[in-house]
Interface confidence: low
Amino acid sequence: APTSSSTKKTQLQLEHLLLDLQMILNGINNYKNPKLTRMLTFKFYMPKKATELKHLQCLEEELKPLEEVLNLAQSKNFHLRPRDLISNINVIVLELKGSETTFMCEYADETATIVEFLNRWITFCQSIISTLT
């Protein structure tokens, strides 16, 4: 059974993940981003079901494509360096989903834009956080 300290750690990790995802979304949605139209042409796979931490496997598998798209952004916000962001997200995702069980991610038939993809995982984080608090 999860202890209160492990629940708190999970909550903090989810909050960090949420912050990073929101930051990416803010960065690419910025009206000054000249590459947004081009970025929206990239397609991302969405999870068929994402209700548990193990489903973060679906996010992990899309981190490489996400980094490639973010490399187009060239944001003026120095801390939005794609390599750093994706590395941070990857560390958090690995800790949250655990490595005890191997989970095969199931994807929905329809692909999504980067904005839809990020919003989906932001909602996922918010949903799990709400069950922990």
Partner: antibody
């Protein structure tokens, strides 16, 4: 445990050079930015700039560009802040801090007092 | 650069009272990019709040942050003796990072 340990207090004369250090431990030093913050006597905090020790990518606040140099030696997990010619107005407490990707400073060194006086 | 103005400059309160500190930005700051720090005399600052409202690891729940756009607030619900210190807000949404001038919370 994440720790940033800074070098000791310095007393210098105007025109002299100086290099202070900040050694990181308890985390992957090459994977986080290190920021430097100045606090003049009785005053607030001023962000000077940052370095990414993994590849020495460095960014400065316009107020400090050309006034100081930030560097790092990843082999010994240490970041540096240096001056080639100190002025009396450089007298301050200097802090190094680990800067998260998002931009907040989550772990701080204990600070290094620099006094410049003739 | 974004200028942050903190008010009041000094807040004189008694232990057990509620403290409300304000931070106003010269231009809109995404709430994901505002932090609060506590600094005690002779010590380095300590991160309290990031993302405007998320408490940093190990920070007691009497500390809470709120706000969006240009107006942000740090609230300490019941002041403990160890909470008397200087508090700084910081924006990290655009370069250069900037700090507010600080609010000193002192014992009345």
């Amino acid at each position: 445990e994440v720790q940033l340990v800074q070098s000791g207090a310095e007393v210098k004369k105007p025109g002299e050079s100086l290099k202070i250090s900040c050694k990181g431990s308890g985390y992957s030093f090459t994977s986080y930015w290190i920021g430097w913050v100045r606090q003049m006597p009785g005053k607030g905090l001023e962000w000077m700039g940052i370095i990414y020790p993994g590849d020495s990518d460095t960014r400065y606040s316009p107020s400090f560009q050309g006034q100081v140099t930030i560097s790092a030696d990843k082999s010994i997990s240490t970041a540096y802040l240096q001056w080639s010619s100190l002025k009396a107005s450089d007298t301050a407490m200097y802090y190094c801090a680990r800067q998260q990707v998002a931009g907040m400073l989550d772990y701080w060194g204990q600070g290094t007092t620099v006094t410049v006086s003739s | 650069e974004i200028v942050l103005t903190q008010s009041p400059g000094t807040l004189s309160l008694s232990p057990g009272e509620r403290a409300t500190l304000s931070c106003r930005a010269s231009q809109s700051v995404s709430s994901s990019y505002l932090a609060w720090y506590q600094q005690k005399p002779g010590q380095a600052p300590r991160l309290l709040i990031y993302g405007a409202s998320s408490r940093a690891t190990g920070i007691p729940d009497r500390f809470s942050g709120s706000g969006s756009g240009t107006d942000f607030t740090l609230t300490i619900s019941r002041l403990e003796p160890e909470d008397f210190a200087v508090y700084y807000c910081q924006q990290y949404g655009s370069s250069p990072l900037t700090f507010g001038g600080g609010t000193k919370v002192e014992i009345k």
